[in-house]
């Protein structure tokens, strides 16, 4: 399931990587790819009891 990318800021935001908006850093091939090509179950804050929903990747992660 893919949705449009959203910006990610806050405690979990990493140091920025040189990806343009709507691209995400692929750790395995070490370059930027379309966020929709990667998949994630974005973790909820600690203490949440239901499974994390599947979301699109955040740019520049």
């Amino acid at each position: 399931m893919r949705r449009g990318p959203r910006s990610l800021r806050g405690r979990d935001a990493p140091a920025p990587t040189p990806c343009v908006p709507a691209e995400c850093f692929d750790l395995l091939v070490r370059h930027c790819v379309a966020c929709g090509l990667l998949r994630t179950a974005r973790p909820k804050p600690a203490g949440a009891s239901s499974p994390a929903p599947r979301t699109a990747l955040q740019p520049q992660e």
């Epitope: 399931m1 893919r2 979990d12 990493p14 140091a15 920025p16 990587t17 995400c24 850093f25 692929d26 750790l27 395995l28 091939v29 929709g36 090509l37 990667l38 998949r39 994630t40 179950a41 974005r42 973790p43 599947r54 990747l57 955040q58 992660e61």
Partner: antibody
């Protein structure tokens, strides 16, 4: 919910080929990285390799040229082949999906025990 | 490849006790992007591994707050503040910083004393 299920023979003879299928529901294998991991008796986990959204593959060098991972996007399945198996390949084999934001294995199959014995 | 050294291999505890598991990597797990991709999984008997902690100290969805992760660089610790029966199983640390290949610790079996 994404679900993975391994299938294939539970007994393989030495020198033969181990072939397993991972069937994915709830997500498309054209997105993300899809992996094979095995657990030996005694709890050691070994990462075997992946097939990516583009169909590119990575194989752990420890498996030399014995391993092949392929996919069929029309069936939403990916496959493991391990050639020339020995008793040392006896293990529980898992397929797993990789989270592409934090890079952990977020979904695993139940695992299938494969015994190599004559 | 990054070698993950986990201790102890076996950890007998009494229910209600605190448990601590150590994981050491052969190289720093700080990625060039600033993240440390060190994760903890629990494999309960008869089940596949399930994620507990991601990126050193973040509890995954649904994981009780008695589980906590800490550490930096090459040295990491998983603590269970009050062990419950449902916590029994094999705990693995894993790194995703220097990949591929992904590598795992040798596992720590948490069992009742």
């Amino acid at each position: 919910d994404v679900q993975l299920q391994e299938s294939g023979p539970s007994l393989v003879k030495p020198s033969q080929t181990l072939s397993l299928t991972c069937s994915v529901t709830g997500d498309s294998i054209t997105s993300g990285y899809w992996n094979w991991i095995r657990k030996f008796p005694g709890n050691k986990l070994e990462y075997m390799g992946y097939i990516s959204y583009s169909g590119s593959t990575y194989y752990n060098p420890s498996l030399k040229s014995r391993i092949s991972i392929t996919r069929d996007t029309s069936k939403n399945q990916f496959y493991l082949q391990l050639l020339s198996v020995t008793t040392e390949d006896t293990a529980t084999y898992y397929c797993a999906g990789l989270d592409g934001l934090y890079w952990y294995f977020d979904v695993w199959g139940a695992g299938t025990l494969v015994t190599v014995s004559s | 490849d990054i070698v993950m050294t986990q201790t102890p291999l076996s950890l007998p505890v009494s229910l209600g006790d605190q448990a601590s598991i150590s994981c050491r990597s052969s190289q720093s797990l700080v990625h060039s992007n600033g993240n440390t991709y060190l994760h903890w999984y629990l494999q309960k008997p008869g089940q596949s591994p399930k994620l507990l902690i991601y990126k050193v100290s973040n509890r995954f969805s649904g994981v009780p707050d008695r589980f906590s992760g800490s550490g930096s660089g090459t040295d990491f610790t998983l603590k269970i503040s009050r062990v419950e029966a449902e916590d029994l199983g094999v705990y693995f640390c894993s790194q995703s910083t220097h990949v591929p290949p992904f590598t795992f610790g040798s596992g720590t079996k948490l069992e009742i004393k």
